[in-house]
């Protein structure tokens, strides 16, 4: 004989669990239906009547199958420095992301951003690393030999020094090399390519905003261990 299909509510067999999209109601001591995403429990089940579900009201949601008596409130509207990447619907919370030039300093459980901060800027001698800090902020790395950055920017990377046949001023981490004009009388001399070496540079990024976890890490060019620079108040 085929097994009987139990309709909710039903008492589970001893030691067994309720089926998918059901829950065990400890008061009724029955397996009862959950409500679908976008709904909540309006009336809990009894021993003889199943759960009654109702749609979430405006600005509230449930994302999962559930038996909550009230839907969750959607997060507040995105602030002026954010963009709404997911609207509040009956089945999902609003998600806010930071606009360009900012990173998320404080995330909610749902992945929305609660607080955006301006991206840190890397000063001369430092370029933006290809990877980001765990919090999404810019990582600055000292320009490696043969490269430089002469800007204060949250996007600029270290660029290679120009290659001179005759070097007038060597480049360093914060300035490009300056080439000497070629003399016609020296044009027969075999060319030597000069790649300048960087001079020691400070390792302090510029333009810090106070706030949570927003000090960028500085990656040295001497190894893989990052040096965490602490922001200090004052000059």
């Amino acid at each position: 004989l085929p097994a009987q299909v139990a309709f909710t509510p039903y008492a589970p067999e001893p030691g067994s669990t309720c089926r998918l999209r059901e829950y065990y109601d400890q008061t009724a001591q029955m397996c009862c239906s959950k409500c679908s995403p976008g709904q909540h429990a309006k009336v809990f089940c009894t021993k003889t009547s199943d759960t009654v579900c109702d749609s979430c009201e405006d600005s509230t949601y449930t994302q999962l199958w559930n038996w909550v008596p009230e839907c969750l409130s959607c997060g507040s509207r995105c602030s002026s420095d954010q963009v709404e990447t997911q609207a509040c619907t009956r089945e999902q919370n609003r998600i806010c992301a930071c606009e360009a030039g900012r990173y998320c300093a404080l995330k909610t459980h749902s992945g929305s951003c609660r607080q955006c901060m301006r991206l840190s800027k890397c000063g001369p001698g430092f370029g933006v690393a290809s990877s980001r800090a765990p919090n999404g902020n810019v990582l600055c790395k000292a320009c490696a030999p043969g490269t430089f950055s002469d800007t204060t920017s949250s996007t600029d990377v270290c660029r290679p020094h120009r290659i001179c046949s005759i070097l007038a001023i060597p480049g360093n981490a914060s300035t490009d090399a300056v080439c000497a004009p070629e003399s016609p009388t020296l044009s027969a001399i075999p060319r030597t390519l000069y790649v300048s070496q960087p001079e020691p540079t400070r390792s302090q990024p510029l333009d810090q905003e106070p706030g949570p976890s927003q000090t960028p890490s500085i990656l040295t060019s001497l190894g893989s261990t990052p040096i965490i620079e602490q922001s200090t108040k004052g000059g």
């Epitope: 400890q26 008061t27 009724a28 429990a41 309006k42 009336v43 809990f44 009894t46 021993k47 003889t48 009547s49 009654v52 008596p69 009230e70």
Partner: antibody, heavy 119, light 106 residues
């Protein structure tokens, strides 16, 4: 407007059976999700839940008192009746009936009736 | 059965004080807790249900919080009319009231 009112004897003798009636208006026990429960409060003590009946006649009792309690409803009369057998002086209390919502909390209470158990 | 341990059993505070009452359940009650205000000679009045949902007409100085087995009722600024006994009710598994907290004005 939702109202509930308890009625019954004010004095019962030990070993007797207490019968209390809750008469309500402003809602119906034939409406999905509606329920009525009984709660008592002995003098100087905390509230204690006794029993509950739903619109679909499903009943729940306080496990400590289950053997002594019976709850019934008369939907047409808008009444719920609680009987409690083998009364004892420790059962002296104010007895309340209250409406219960579909999500199981009491939202509106009756004024209460005082029952004294004494010989 | 679920036991509800309510504390303190009584308290005395000044008008304007912040008052906190706690209820601890003997197991997880999934936020199914309500709070009632009971004044002498009056009917118990529902203040809050499902941990933090304020009943219509209840002053905003009353608030509820908690999860799992620990729950709190807070009166942010005690008023003379708040003198009463307050009870928690768990309704996660059957129904159990806490022992009550008598609130008085100093």
């Amino acid at each position: 407007q939702v109202t509930l009112k308890e009625s019954g004897p004010t004095l019962v003798k030990p070993t007797q059976t207490l019968t209390l009636t809750c008469t309500f208006s402003g809602f119906s026990l034939s409406t999905l999700g509606m329920g009525v429960g009984w709660i008592r409060q002995p003098p100087g003590k905390a509230l204690e839940w006794l029993a509950h009946i739903w619109w679909d006649a499903d009943k729940y009792y306080n496990p400590a008192l289950k053997s002594r309690l019976t709850i019934t409803k008369d939907t047409s009369k808008n009444q719920v009746v609680l009987t409690m057998t083998n009364m004892d002086p420790v059962d002296t209390a104010t007895y309340y009936c209250a409406r219960m919502t579909g999500t199981r909390y009491f939202d509106v209470w009756g004024q209460g009736t005082t029952v004294t158990v004494s010989s | 059965d679920i036991q509800m341990t309510q504390s303190p059993s009584s308290l005395s505070a000044s008008v304007g004080d912040r008052v906190t009452i706690t209820c601890k359940a003997s197991q997880n009650i999934n936020k199914f807790i309500a709070w009632y205000q009971h004044k002498p000679g009056k009917v118990p009045k529902l203040l809050i249900h499902y941990t933090s949902t304020l009943q219509p007409g209840v002053p905003s100085r009353f608030s509820g919080s908690g999860s799992g087995s620990d729950y709190t009722l807070t009166i942010s600024s005690l008023q003379p009319e708040d003198v009463a006994t307050y009870y928690c009710l768990q309704y996660g598994v059957l129904w159990t009231f806490g022992g009550g907290t008598k609130v008085e004005i100093k």
